[in-house]
């Protein structure tokens, strides 16, 4: 593979890596954040960064409760320089083929180039083409939302069903949930799982006369998606007099395989494409976001793009010391590789963001779950944190116990919007939510020592059970409000955090070979399930499971 973007094989070869190891041993592992605050009255001032969005709204990123000091930050920035993170970043923004194993550009950033500045891939300025797709999305979404687009019986569309999986599902699901406040004209439903229950339960609640299906599969060959799409089509035809001419009014394709789309029966005028430089997990900004535009309206979808574009501008233009996503990525490397942390918790204190951790799980783990570097050698260091999360305060009543008192270091991001879309009961709910957001980060940092526990009346063997070690790192992300622009910015922030991690680990964050093997084996086994013969071609466990399944099916 082409490795012209980096001149090192392993991050451990970099001088700053060794330097950080020494710093970790001499001060990192014993550093007390509580003491750092006592030593430096300006710590918060120095370690919080405020991002200003294109619309003037702000997001504050507070890194001050992390296990770092000036020297550690300086060494981490040195590591970023030695790993040439900015070089790889600039190559990405120039449309170079930084996805070396697939020889592709990584250009999701071009999808949110609302300034329409020239952006080139292989000598082609793709800005006019991106703009043209958005015009198509605007026109189509406005026709559907206004009722100008009608179903085969002349009724307006009331429901949209997006059928896709992975990147063709997770992004739109998360964004439509997060921006539910901005909806109102249409209902959206998402079908992803091959489990027949998913499509069956969805079809129970929609009316064929007023439903629009979006089939989201770039190649139009994704097994789960096409199976679900055919089931939806068969259901639709069975309810509408088996007239294939009605399909055109009720199905659109988010795909570039014109031949298969036409074969399916979809009018190719209702085909929304995107290029090979858009990876699935980065595709919510593309035509894959059509369900979002339909749900919240095109103008809000464009604000979502502009919020991400504003973070792109920050990431490309801000010096390393103040570069918010870069710092986020460096902290992740610091915990992962020097503290041995294996996880990363993202807890949104916001019910609208309940699918945000699931979205970030794919973004982070599919990108950086790699063990071979751009130099084609296996890493001798940990990569790819296990990202997890749930909305708080729910999470406080489940896994936060382990975060506070468990044996593992779990670096955590807490996210809150100061202004609620639902400030009910004179903002009582919002104040309770916010108090927990502040309290959890404080509690994780300050902990509670034996002395305090005893002062509160605990005695004997109960004392150690009530001790909190503290010094557990959090990054607090405080937005003004969860708007389309804010959400776009938050996603782009995590995209560039993920990019920074991958650049330092020198892995290709833009392929996903790990999804292939299971798919291939599933095809083989699929054929074996079609007959009644006893299976003996696999290992004893797999044979045993298949045969028991066949007996019970």
């Amino acid at each position: 593979s082409n490795n012209s973007f980096t001149n090192f094989k392993l991050a451990t070869e970099l001088p700053a890596w060794s330097k950080l190891q020494k710093i970790y041993e001499s001060q990192g592992k014993t550093l007390s954040v509580k003491q750092e605050f006592q030593k430096d009255a300006k710590r918060f001032e120095k370690l919080n960064k405020t991002f200003t969005n294109y619309d003037g709204s702000k997001i504050l990123f507070d890194y001050s409760k992390n296990l770092v000091n000036d020297e550690i930050i300086a060494a981490l920035i040195e590591l970023a320089k030695e790993a040439n993170v900015t070089g790889l970043r600039d190559a990405m923004f120039k449309g170079e083929h930084i996805n070396s194993t697939e020889d592709r550009a990584v250009y999701h950033v071009a999808l949110r180039n609302r300034a329409n500045k020239p952006m080139y891939v292989d000598g082609v300025n793709v800005a006019p083409e991106v703009d043209s797709v958005l015009k198509h999305m605007k026109e189509f979404s406005e026709q559907v939302r206004s009722g100008e687009w009608k179903g085969y019986t002349g009724k307006k569309i009331t429901d949209v069903v997006n059928i896709g999986i992975g990147g063709s599902d997770l992004g739109p699901v998360m964004v439509t949930e997060a921006l539910k406040h901005y909806a109102g004209v249409l209902d959206v439903h998402f079908v992803s799982n091959i489990d027949g229950t998913h499509i069956a339960e969805t079809l129970k609640v929609v009316d064929p006369e007023t439903t629009l299906f979006l089939i989201a599969s770039k190649t139009f060959t994704t097994a789960e998606t096409i199976t679900n799409a055919n089931t939806a089509k068969n259901w639709f035809l069975s309810k509408t007099g088996n007239d294939p001419s009605h399909i055109a009014k009720h199905f659109a394709a988010l795909s570039t395989n014109e031949t298969e789309v036409a074969k399916f029966g979809i009018d190719t005028k209702n085909m929304f494409g995107f290029e090979s430089w858009v990876g699935g997990r980065y595709s919510v900004w593309s035509a894959i976001g059509l369900s979002v535009a339909l749900y919240i309206g095109y103008d809000n979808f464009e604000a979502f793009l502009k919020g991400a574009e504003a973070v792109d501008n920050h990431f490309t233009q801000t010096p390393l010391e103040d570069n918010i996503p870069l710092l986020g990525g460096l902290l992740s490397v610091w915990y992962n590789n020097f503290f041995g942390a294996q996880t990363h918790l993202v807890a949104p204190f916001d019910q609208y963001l309940h699918r945000f951790p699931a979205y970030l799980q794919q973004l982070s783990m599919e990108s950086n779950g790699k063990s071979v570097t751009r130099g084609n050698v296996f890493t001798d260091y940990s990569t790819g944190s296990i990202l997890f999360g749930e909305p708080a305060t729910n999470a406080q009543h489940s896994f936060f116990q382990l975060v506070h008192q468990g044996t593992k270091l779990i670096p955590s991001d807490f996210i809150l919007a100061a202004q609620s879309h639902n400030p009910i009961e004179n903002k009582l709910h919002q104040k309770m939510l916010a108090s927990n957001f502040f309290a959890q980060a404080e509690a994780l940092m300050v902990g509670k020592d034996e002395e305090q526990v005893k002062a509160e009346g605990a005695t004997g063997g109960l004392v150690p059970h009530k001790v909190f070690s503290g010094n557990r790192p959090t990054t607090s992300i405080l937005a003004q409000k969860i708007t389309p622009a804010t959400l776009g910015a938050l996603i782009a922030y995590y995209e560039h955090v993920t990019f920074t991690e991958g650049a330092i680990w020198n892995i290709n964050s833009f392929d996903q070979w790990g999804v292939e093997l299971g798919k291939v084996l599933a095809k083989v086994i699929g054929k074996e399930l079609d007959n009644s013969s006893t299976i003996s071609t696999h290992d004893a466990s797999t044979n045993g499971l298949i045969n028991q399944f066949k007996e019970w099916m």
Epitope: V124, D131, V133, H136, E139, E258, M271, G273
Partner: nanobody, 118 residues
Framework: QVQLVESGGGLVQPGGSLRLSCAAS????????MAWYRQAPGKQRDMVAD???????NYADSVKGRFTISRDNAKNTVYLQMNSLKSEDTAVYYC????????????WGQGTQVTVSS
Amino acid sequence: QVQLVESGGGLVQPGGSLRLSCAASGISFGSYTMAWYRQAPGKQRDMVADITTGGRTNYADSVKGRFTISRDNAKNTVYLQMNSLKSEDTAVYYCKADFAYGRDLTYWGQGTQVTVSS
């Protein structure tokens, strides 16, 4: 910048053949429906043939069975094979690129002259 450059035109006798080529640069060629149009003196520009991103073709009635449109995505080129040419095929032939997945994104070539005369 975007360029569509036609070539292959010329003078040919009735019943003869010509092959027009249109080389595109500066566009994501595989994402465009490519078409040939023609304009005879004093007449409007008419569609001759087009080919979609997936290779589906469409022809004007007057050229069906005589003309064949094809594309080579690796070479960013679209072709028009013209057989059994007639004097009424005399015109300037233009190449057109229409972005298949969007709206309002169309490019034209400068045209190449085809003259069918004995």
